[in-house]
Interface confidence: low
C-alpha cells in the first residue's frame, strides 16, 4: 500500500508569492510560492495518486502583514481552501496567546490540530479541551493512518503560551499516544510536528511505532541529487534514521516560507512496515501556474493590508534617526527603540529568579535603512516602518558565549570610519571603544545587563558565561561578516517579523521618545575589564 | 570534510593581473562568508578580502580599488581579481570559509619589477 505525504512546514505567513530569497514578491515572473501556486500542485498530485496526506508542521503564524492584520484568521481561511489533512501547532501559533490561536485558528479550522505533549490545565483546560488533539487516525483511500502531533517544548520561551499550558518532553510524550494508536489496531503512524531536525532524528530513533517524522521549526532543507534553487541541503531527502529497535524511519523537512512542497512515497507491506520510501520538496516556481480561484480570493483579502499599512501605529515626538551617517558610525535613536522593541517583544516572565530570560539585544547599523522624521504630525505607519526594515527578516533568540559576543564587537569596528552596516546597535549592552587601539584589541568596556536579578544592572561580560541575546537573523546567518555568531552559537530560534515587533511595541507605547543614552561610547584611555 | 582547491596563481610583472579562483567543497557554501588571504615568506598569514554570503565585500586597505573579490555559488567558487599587482602583492594566497578550518595548498603570486 502506498502513501503520499504531502507536506510544508515554517510557512510564516507567506500567503502571496515571494521572490526567490522569501521576501516580497517583484518580478512577477521570477516568483514563488504563495498558496494559489501551491494548491495547483496538491490538486495536480491528487488527481494523479490515490492516497495522499497534505499535512503542515507548524508555524503558520507570523511573518508579514498578513498576520499581523488578519491574526490567523487568514491561516484558518487558506489552509480550510487547500484541504489541509491535519497540522501540528508550532511555537508561533502562540504569539498572540492562546486566546489568539482558539479563536482565529483551533475554533475555525476544518481539519485537525494535534500536539501530544501541550496538556492544558486549570480554568484553560474546560475551554480549549477538543479544539486541540494529541493524536488524529484519518482513513486514506481503504486504509487508516494515524498522525500524531508535537511541538517545541521550549515554546513559553519563544512564544506567549500563558501559564495554563505545560509543555512536555516530546519523546516521553509521545510514546504513549503511539502506544494508544497501536491498540486501535493503527499500524501506519506519522509524527508531525514542530522542534527541529535534532528532535525529529531523536523522535525516530527512540519512539517506538513511529514509521515516519514529518517536522518543521529548524528550515531544514533536504534534497536528492542536484538542488533546484539557492538553499543547501543539510541531507538527503528523506533522511533515513535508524531507530533503537532497527526499523529504518524516515525523516523530512520542507525548508520553509513555502517555497517547497515536501513531497514522500511511502509504500507499507500489509502489517504496517515501511518497505521503501523516496521523493524530494518540489520547488514552487513560475512553471507552476496559480491557481485562479485561490488567486481571486487572495486579491480579495489583500485590499485590507494596503488599507492597514498606511494607518498610525502611534507616534514619535522626536526625530527617529535611522540614518546610515548615524547608525553607521554612533549610537542612534532608531537603533535604541528597534532594540527596546525587541526585547520588549521577548518579555516572559519563566521563573521567578529571573526579571526576564533575555535582556541583550545586538542589530547591524546596516540593517536599519530609513529614518522617521518626526514633523509629520509625528505619525508612524507601517508603510514608514518597512522603508526601515525592508529586508523581510526576522528577530531571533540566540545562545552565545561572552567570548563570542566580545568578538562580535571586535568586529563591530574592526574597520570603523568606512561607513560599513557591521556597526552593533544595541540594547541591554553598554560597550566603550578604543580606535586608537589596533582592529581586533578595541572593545575596553562590554558590560551586559542582568537577567537573574530583582533590580536589572550592567556587569561585565564574562567570557566562559552563556548569554541569551536578541538579533536580527541576518547576523544569526553571520551576515555582515559575523561570522563568529553562526560558527559559535549554541543555540538558535527563530523569532517574530522584524517590522511587526517595532510596530507592536510603538502601538503598545502610543507615543515614544527614544534617546541616545550612552550604550556605545568612545573613549581614547584605557579602561581595564 | 571541508576541501579548498586554490588555483590561478603566476608570475606577473608590475601593474599586471590575474584572476584567482578558490573551489570549495563540504561546506553549505550559498550560507557560508568566504575569504581570501595571503602569506608573504616569514610572515603571518594576513586576511585580503571577504565576501558575505550576501555578496558584502571588505578590503584591507592595501588592495582596495585594485582587487575584487566575488562568488559563484553555482560552481562553489570564490575568485579574486587582482589587478595593478605591484611587487609587495607577492605571497601565497589561500582562501577560506572560517578562518580555523584546514587550509588549502594555496596558489604562488610572484610580481617582479
Known amino acids: 500500500w502506498e502513501l503520499t505525504i504531502l507536506h510544508t512546514n515554517d510557512v510564516h505567513s507567506r500567503l502571496e508569492q515571494t521572490s526567490e530569497d522569501s521576501s516580497k514578491c517583484v518580478n512577477a515572473s521570477r516568483c514563488m510560492g504563495g498558496v494559489a501556486r501551491l494548491f495547483t500542485k496538491v490538486q495536480q498530485i491528487r488527481r494523479a495518486e490515490p492516497n495522499v496526506l497534505l499535512l503542515d508542521a507548524g508555524d503558520q503564524y507570523q511573518g508579514t502583514i498578513w498576520f499581523t492584520v488578519y491574526k490567523g484568521a487568514e491561516v484558518a481561511h487558506f489552509m480550510n481552501a487547500l484541504r489541509y489533512d491535519a497540522m501540528a501547532l508550532g511555537n508561533h501559533e502562540f504569539d498572540n496567546g492562546v486566546e489568539g490561536l482558539i479563536e482565529p485558528l483551533l475554533k475555525e479550522a476544518k481539519f485537525p490540530i494535534l500536539s501530544a505533549n501541550i496538556k492544558a490545565k486549570g480554568p484553560l483546560a474546560s475551554q480549549i479541551s477538543g479544539l486541540y488533539l494529541p493524536y488524529k487516525v484519518l482513513p486514506v483511500g481503504d486504509e487508516v493512518v494515524g498522525i500524531v502531533g508535537y511541538t517545541s517544548k521550549e515554546t513559553p520561551f519563544l512564544s506567549n503560551p500563558g501559564t495554563n499550558l505545560v509543555f512536555e518532553d516530546e519523546i516521553t510524550a509521545l510514546q504513549p499516544e503511539v502506544d494508544k494508536l497501536k491498540t486501535l489496531n493503527v499500524n501506519k503512524i506519522i509524527a508531525l510536528g514542530h522542534s527541529g531536525f535534532e528532535m525529529d532524528k531523536l523522535i525516530a530513533q527512540k519512539v517506538r511505532g513511529v514509521d515516519v517524522v514529518v517536522g518543521g521549526h529548524s528550515n531544514t532543507f533536504l534534497y536528492t541529487g542536484n538542488p533546484p534553487s539557492k538553499e543547501v541541503p543539510a541531507g538527503k531527502y528523506p533522511f533515513i534514521v535508524t531507530s533503537d529497535d532497527g526499523r529504518k524511519v524516515p525523516v523530512v523537512q520542507a525548508y520553509a516560507f513555502g517555497k517547497y512542497l515536501g513531497y514522500l512515497k511511502i509504500e507499507f507491506d500489509e502489517r504496517g512496515n515501511v518497505i521503501s520510501s523516496h521523493g524530494n520538496p518540489i520547488l514552487l516556481n513560475s512553471s507552476i501556474p496559480e491557481d485562479p480561484s485561490i488567486k481571486a480570493d487572495i486579491n480579495k483579502w489583500r485590499i485590507k493590508l494596503d488599507n492597514y499599512s498606511t494607518q498610525e501605529l502611534g507616534k514619535t515626538i522626536v526625530y527617529l534617526d535611522g540614518s546610515s551617517q548615524s547608525c553607521r558610525f554612533r549610537e542612534c535613536n532608531m537603533g535604541n527603540l528597534i532594540c527596546d522593541a525587541m526585547i520588549n517583544n521577548n518579555l516572559r516572565h519563566t521563573d521567578e529568579m529571573f526579571w526576564n530570560h533575555v535582556s541583550m539585544c545586538i542589530l547591524n547599523g546596516g540593517g536599519i535603512r530609513s529614518p522617521i522624521d518626526e514633523r509629520n504630525n509625528g505619525t508612524i505607519t507601517w508603510e514608514n516602518l518597512a522603508a526601515v526594515l525592508p529586508f523581510g527578516g526576522t528577530f531571533d533568540l540566540v545562545q552565545l558565549k561572552g567570548s563570542t559576543l566580545k568578538k562580535a564587537f571586535e568586529h563591530s569596528v574592526h574597520r570603523y570610519g568606512q561607513s560599513t552596516g557591521e556597526f552593533l546597535q544595541v540594547g541591554g549592552i553598554h560597550v566603550v571603544y578604543d580606535l586608537s587601539r589596533k582592529p581586533g584589541d578595541r572593545v575596553v568596556k562590554l558590560d551586559v545587563l542582568c537577567t537573574k536579578c530583582r533590580v536589572p544592572s550592567y556587569d561585565p561580560l564574562k567570557m566562559d558565561e552563556v548569554y541569551k541575546v536578541i538579533l536580527p537573523n541576518f547576523l544569526a546567518n553571520g551576515g555582515d561578516g559575523f561570522q563568529m555568531i553562526k560558527d559559535e552559537l549554541l543555540r538558535h530560534d527563530s523569532g517574530d517579523q522584524d517590522i511587526n515587533v517595532v510596530s507592536t511595541y510603538i502601538s503598545k507605547m502610543k507615543v515614544i521618545y527614544p534617546a541616545v543614552e550612552g550604550r556605545i561610547k568612545f573613549s581614547h584611555h584605557h579602561h581595564h575589564h | 570534510q571541508v576541501k579548498l582547491q586554490e588555483s590561478g596563481g603566476g608570475r606577473v610583472q608590475t601593474g599586471g593581473s590575474l584572476r584567482l579562483s578558490c573551489a570549495a567543497s563540504g561546506i553549505s557554501f550559498s550560507i557560508t562568508t568566504m575569504y581570501w588571504y595571503r602569506q608573504a615568506p616569514g610572515e603571518q598569514r594576513q586576511l585580503v578580502a571577504l565576501?558575505?554570503?550576501?555578496?558584502?565585500?571588505y578590503y584591507v586597505d592595501s588592495v582596495k580599488g585594485r582587487f575584487t573579490i566575488s562568488r559563484d555559488d553555482s560552481k562553489n567558487t570564490v575568485y579574486l581579481q587582482m589587478n595593478d599587482l605591484k611587487p609587495e602583492d607577492t605571497a601565497v594566497y589561500f582562501c577560506?570559509?572560517?578562518?580555523?578550518?584546514?587550509w588549502g595548498q594555496g596558489t604562488q603570486v610572484t610580481v617582479s619589477s
Open positions: 577560506n570559509s572560517i578562518p580555523g578550518n584546514d
Open positions: 565576501i558575505t554570503d550576501r555578496g558584502n565585500t
